[in-house]
Interface confidence: medium
């Protein structure tokens, strides 16, 4: 807290300019009018104030706006945003995407801070849903943003917003998140033709059910092994050898290198060895010839 002292004669700041960098903290407190600061916030970012001086400027704004800053001030906070606490930000009502972009720009290239997380949370809650423009903006600044949301939060993403998602935005998503996003993506891209559809849906397939994988196998999509390895194990297990062969196309040869890893390992254990042999890849571990295959899940359902 800066002590209240009278401004020395001739030092009252008529405007926010670079001469203020030579003011001591107590002089800034005494000689800069808070209302003037609020109207000329856009100038602060261009002036090399130190952390300590920014503390004083923040203190002045806090006194002027105890209930939270208006958006006209927030939009021009610049580096002063780095001084805000999550508690400060919770008092704000940020509705403009331009304001959000301006503040994200200040933190660009750095990890998502608690301040940024709070700001995004306030903004999204204010809008009621993650619309396409917001998602576009957030994933541009933080490619991992989407995967930081809970499945519950993701459920508020409208299918139209999925068009803003790039493959790298889903890199850190877990199966529970993809389970929520996949049906939205399927809906969003439903009017595209086969090959274009596959290009768009590919990164979401970690949430696809068996029947959709079966359908894709009929479309000559040539899924790469990296995508196949991210599929849900429970969705892959019911696929036949012929369906996997069609799904992977020329990439089927890659199964040999992955035969000890899920979901390939578990899928092999469910296939007849005879059928696996037709691939000519030397895959081992299938059900030996002459053995009866019991579908235990079906048996349990009947009993």
């Amino acid at each position: 807290e800066v002590e209240k002292t009278a401004c020395p004669s001739g030092k009252k700041a008529p405007e926010i300019d670079e001469s203020l960098i030579f003011y001591k903290k107590w002089e800034l407190e005494a000689c800069v009018d808070a209302a003037l600061l609020a109207t000329q916030m856009d100038r602060v970012n261009a002036i090399p104030f130190t952390y300590e001086q920014l503390d004083v400027l923040k203190h002045k704004l806090d006194e002027l706006y105890p209930q939270g800053y208006p958006e006209s001030v927030i939009q021009h906070l610049g580096y002063l945003f780095l001084k805000m606490s999550p508690e400060d930000i919770r008092k704000w009502n940020v509705t403009s995407l331009e304001t959000l972009k301006a503040l994200l720009e200040v933190n660009k290239g750095h990890e998502m801070s608690p301040q940024v997380a709070t700001l995004i949370d306030r903004f999204v809650k204010g809008r009621g849903q993650l619309d396409k423009d917001t998602l576009d903006t957030l994933t541009a600044f933080y490619p991992g943003y989407l995967c930081s949301l809970s499945p519950e939060e993701l459920s508020s993403v409208p299918p139209s917003s999925i068009w803003a998602v790039r493959p790298q935005d889903l890199d850190t998503c877990d199966p529970r998140q993809l389970d929520v996003l996949y049906p939205k993506a399927r809906l969003a891209f439903q009017n595209m033709n086969g090959s274009e559809y596959f290009v768009k849906i590919q990164s979401f397939l970690g949430g696809a059910p068996t029947e959709d994988l079966k359908a894709l196998s009929q479309q000559n999509v040539s899924m790469d092994l990296a995508t196949f390895m991210k599929l849900r194990t429970d969705a892959v297990l019911p696929l036949t050898v012929a369906e996997v062969q069609k799904l992977l196309g020329p990439h089927v040869e890659g199964l040999k290198a992955e035969e000890r890893h899920r979901p390939v390992r578990d899928w092999i254990l469910r296939q007849r060895q005879d059928d696996l042999d037709t691939l000519g890849l030397g895959l081992q571990g299938g059900i030996p010839n002459g053995y009866l295959v019991l579908d235990l899940s079906m048996q349990e359902a009947l009993s």
Partner: nanobody
């Protein structure tokens, strides 16, 4: 983190000149505004001159017309040319970043400037 080493201070008679240098480590040096500060015995540290990443300069009223701040980004160095020195310029001189991204709490040893009358 940027580390700063100041040099070039010494004992000089009033009216004399000195050139201070501040060598900075860190690849991002060129993007930071920089400042020369001084602290006289029993007084608060004060900013004397500042230079932006692009080279624009500002000076405290007490040194305007006498001191010149400059920078060589290729050498990661900031200079302070001090002419027409006065006894009241006697102090330890420090340089530091003036970026809000860098908390100004990591100061170098400084370089002592003593101006005798």
């Amino acid at each position: 983190e940027v580390q700063l080493v100041e040099s070039g201070g010494g004992l000089v008679q009033a009216g004399g000149s000195l050139r201070l240098s501040c060598a900075a480590s860190g690849s991002t040096f060129s993007s930071y505004p920089m400042g020369w500060y001084r602290q006289a015995p029993g007084k608060q540290r004060e900013l004397v001159a500042a230079i932006s990443s692009g080279g624009s300069t500002n000076y405290a009223d007490s040194v305007k017309g006498r001191f010149t701040i400059s920078r060589d980004n290729a050498k990661n160095t900031v200079y302070l040319q001090m002419n027409s020195l006065k006894p009241e310029d006697t102090a330890v001189y420090y340089c530091n970043t003036r970026s809000p991204r860098v908390p100004n709490d990591s100061w170098g040893q400084g370089t002592q400037v003593t101006v005798s009358s």
